[in-house]
């Protein structure tokens, strides 16, 4: 059957933890992505940012998991209003910011 939203969110959080702790070299060769507003619609915005990083196997699972939280199909080059289009940050920092925010959402019971 389908995975409960709370389980899916916890699994996404744990995957982000794995990414942050397994950094030997700069994550995704130091690739830069658009920063996002961590508000409603954040999952799609996060996916839209990360999907533009190609050839980085470390975040492929994260991209797949985020797609499960986003109700519409996301493709490279697609941007929503949630992006802070004048600010780019390294993927590693993006993941850390996203992780902390998701942990707070989990605490608040916002699983979707």
């Amino acid at each position: 059957g389908p995975v409960p939203p709370s389980t899916a969110l916890r699994e996404l959080i744990e995957e982000l933890v794995n990414i942050t702790q397994n950094q030997k070299a700069p994550l995704c060769n130091g690739s830069m992505v658009w920063s996002i507003n961590l508000t409603a619609g954040m999952y799609c915005a996060a996916l839209e940012s990360l999907i533009n990083v190609s050839g980085c196997s470390a975040i492929e699972k994260t991209q797949r998991m985020l797609s499960g939280f986003c109700p519409h199909k996301v493709s490279a080059g697609q941007f929503s209003s949630l992006h802070v289009r004048d600010t780019k940050i390294e993927v590693a920092q993006f993941v850390k910011d996203l992780l902390l925010h998701l942990k707070k959402l989990f605490r608040e019971g916002q699983f979707n």
Partner: antibody, heavy 122, light 108 residues
């Protein structure tokens, strides 16, 4: 100012009961989760129990489950801990603690009482 | 149940940086809080949600949480920082709050 004041501690024999109380003032008591934390002499902190803001949920440490009961009266801004079948290992300073209430009671403890000493001894 | 492991003691000279660790399985997936407790006093919150600092706590105190280790860092340590420090998380699998065993910080 915001304050938590515990009372009810003392010396009690093993197997007997004791009821601790905590009076809250200076903040909106009914909007916070409330916990009891204890500290045996010379030892570390041990979480004991939590009750949600509206009293709808309670959780207990395994070491006290079935013996201790946490309750609250939001109309009187009081928190209680009924301790039954007390054991020597329950000897500790008991702190009343406040934590903002979310879906999970995973918030930090941002206000502590000064504690009340409970000694279980024959 | 979830276990948090802290070193029993850490010693540091005044003005140096103290690092206190808190280990737990994938602790990075949980929000970590840190408390300072001086002898005969109630604990005081010094870091919450991994790295946030209450307004009354000096900027010398900071926190991080990556992988299996959370860290409390105290820069430019002062004699007044000598205390016991405890980490804490909520264990969502058991609905229990969990404390580490505590670390005694000694300022040499």
């Amino acid at each position: 100012q915001m304050q938590l004041v515990e009372s009810g501690g003392g010396v009690v024999q093993p197997g007997r009961s004791l009821r601790l109380s905590c009076a809250a003032s200076g903040f909106e008591f009914r909007t916070y989760g409330m916990h009891w934390v204890r500290q045996a002499p010379g030892k570390g902190l041990e979480w004991v129990a939590v009750i949600w803001d509206d009293g709808s949920n309670t959780h207990y440490a395994d070491s006290v489950k079935g013996r201790f009961t946490i309750t609250r009266d939001n109309s009187k801004n009081t928190l209680n801990l009924q301790m039954n079948s007390l054991r020597a290992e329950d000897t500790a300073v008991y702190y009343c603690v406040r934590a903002p209430q979310w879906y999970l009671t995973a918030e930090a403890f941002d206000l502590w009482g000064q504690g009340t000493m409970v000694t279980v001894s024959s | 149940s979830y276990v948090l492991t802290q070193p029993p003691s850490v010693s540091v000279a005044p003005g140096e940086t103290a690092t206190i660790t808190c280990g737990g399985n994938l602790i990075g997936a949980r929000l970590v809080h840190w408390y300072q407790q001086k002898p005969g006093q109630a604990p005081v919150l010094v870091i919450y949600d991994d790295s946030d600092r209450p307004s009354r706590i000096p900027e010398r105190f900071s926190g991080s949480n990556i992988g299996n280790t959370a860290t409390l860092t105290i820069e430019r340590v002062e004699e007044g920082d000598e205390a016991d420090y405890y980490c804490q998380v909520w264990d969502y699998s058991s609905d229990h709050m969990v404390f580490g065993g505590g670390t005694k910080l000694t300022v040499l």
